[in-house]
Interface confidence: low
């Protein structure tokens, strides 16, 4: 656990908007104590879903009865420590993050729950939640040990729109074989018919007396 | 070092009691999972029951029901599993080992460490 | 309460050799969030077992890369490319879906 004195994160809520260096986190763990520590507790794994959502509860062993609360989701990678997100709120109310944030949460006494959406395989890491008390004083500074988030990216499932394209390609690929197919054959078989044809047409004797032609149909038996 | 550190052999009665320690170092020890696994002589594993080492939740397994407790000391980071009216059948090697399910029952991942074991001997 | 079936009881090998170990379960170990929460274990003769694979195909840390797991709901394999002596003892399936968490009857490595 670690204390950062007084200072209040007034930290923008932007998505993982600030990049600390691990110098800059090691100063802030070990400054001089001018705040209380508090124990923060979180799951060692989650696993995210196949739609890239994972959910975790933090709880925190709160030692006075704190009105408003901030709550950040730190993400360590490698050297670095990037601020998911972060939301303030005041006990018994909703937990509000910005619009465009991937975290939603509610909160139950002494326990926050925490999802963070649209997560992929590279954003598996550490996920550390921070739990500040922020008023009445004195300000009390919680750090859970982190998170493993584990996430796989599901088979990818090919666009509907693009599946639309490759089916009207293919169709209109056959119509127009099989138009030509027709056109090919038609005139083979126009070529067979009038070799030679000038385009001049003589009335011939019939050779066998002018009579209906009889059209024989198949003979289908029903039994 | 990372390690879980078990209790002594017993040798008990049919009948008896036995509470077998897990003492964990090395790692947060509120931040995982105990599982309890047993081995009978020359035979496989069973699983036989969970707890959070950071809020006491327990899972049990139906057949052992009624007769096991599990319980934590988080001051000493210590689980311990006790085994009340033995039988000989109960007679086997007691693992105790990690699980990363802290809050919750339900689903579990994996054990990725074990302690050595303690053995157990039920005669009369 | 889900039954792991593991193929073969014993499965003598020679140094270098591969080796295939098999594990089925009664019932779909693939969890809705895509995962398949089977793990595999070595029970090296006279110590406690060990992880070596966990949801299926996840290598433990430390784990050597000739190991390898795969397979998806019901049916499931452990590989060991090239089997080394250190490799010897018995390989346990579990199923880590529900509880009664349950493994498999085992199956014993050993060299020829």
């Known amino acids: 656990m670690a204390c950062l004195g007084f200072q209040r994160h007034k930290a923008q809520l932007n998505l993982a908007t600030r990049t600390w260096p691990c110098t800059l986190l090691f100063f802030l763990l070990f400054i001089p104590v001018f705040c209380k520590a508090m124990h923060v507790a979180q799951p060692a794994v989650v696993l995210a879903s196949s739609r890239g959502i994972a959910s975790f509860v933090c709880e925190y062993a709160s030692p006075g009865k704190a009105t408003e609360v901030r709550v950040t989701v730190l993400r360590q990678a490698d050297s670095q420590v990037t601020e998911v997100c972060a939301a303030t709120y005041m006990m018994g109310n909703e937990l509000t993050f910005l619009d465009d944030s991937i975290c939603t949460g509610t909160s139950s006494g002494n326990q926050v729950n925490l999802t963070i959406q649209g997560l992929r395989a590279m954003d598996t890491g550490l996920y550390i939640c921070k739990v500040e008390l922020m008023y009445p004083p004195p300000y009390y500074l919680g750090i859970g040990n982190g998170t493993q988030i584990y996430v796989i990216d599901p088979e990818p499932c090919p666009d509907s729109d693009f599946l639309l394209w490759i089916l009207a390609a293919v169709s209109s690929g056959l119509f127009f074989y099989s138009f030509l197919l027709t056109a090919v054959s038609l005139s083979k078989m126009l070529k067979k018919r009038s070799p030679l044809t000038t385009g001049v047409y003589v009335k011939m004797p019939p050779t066998e007396p002018e009579c209906e032609k009889q059209f024989q149909p198949y003979f289908i038996p029903i039994n | 070092q990372v390690q879980l550190v078990q209790s002594g052999a017993e040798v008990k009665k049919p009948g008896a009691s036995v509470k077998v320690s897990c003492k964990a170092s090395g790692y947060t020890f509120t931040s995982y999972g105990i599982n309890w696994v047993r081995q009978a002589p020359g035979q496989g594993l069973e699983w036989m029951g969970w707890?959070?080492?950071?809020?006491?939740?327990?899972n049990y397994a139906q057949k052992l029901q009624g007769r096991v407790t599990m319980t934590t000391d988080t001051s000493t980071s210590t689980a311990y599993m006790e085994l009340r009216s033995l039988r000989s059948d109960d007679t086997a090697v007691y693992y105790c080992?990690?699980?990363?399910?802290?809050?919750?029952?339900?689903?579990?991942?994996?054990?990725?460490?074990w302690g050595r074991g303690t053995l157990v001997t039920v005669s009369s | 309460d889900i039954v792991m079936t593991q193929s073969p009881l014993s499965l003598p090998v020679t140094p270098g050799e591969p080796a295939s170990i098999s594990c089925r379960s009664s019932?779909?170990?693939?969890?809705?969030?895509?995962?398949?929460?089977l793990d595999w274990y070595l029970q090296k003769p006279g110590q406690s077992p060990q992880l070596l694979i966990y949801?299926?195909?996840n290598r433990a840390s430390g784990v050597p890369d000739r190991f390898s797991g795969s397979g998806s709901g019901t049916d499931f394999t452990l590989k060991i490319s090239r089997v080394e002596a250190e490799d010897v003892g018995v390989y346990y399936c579990m199923q880590a879906l529900q509880t009664p968490l349950t493994f498999g009857g085992g199956t014993k490595v050993e060299i020829k």
């Open positions: 080992a990690r699980d990363p399910v802290t809050m919750v029952r339900g689903v579990h991942w994996y054990f990725d460490l």
């Open positions: 707890i959070s080492a950071y809020n006491g939740n327990t």
């Open positions: 949801l299926g195909s």
């Open positions: 019932q779909s170990l693939l969890h809705s969030n895509g995962y398949n929460y």
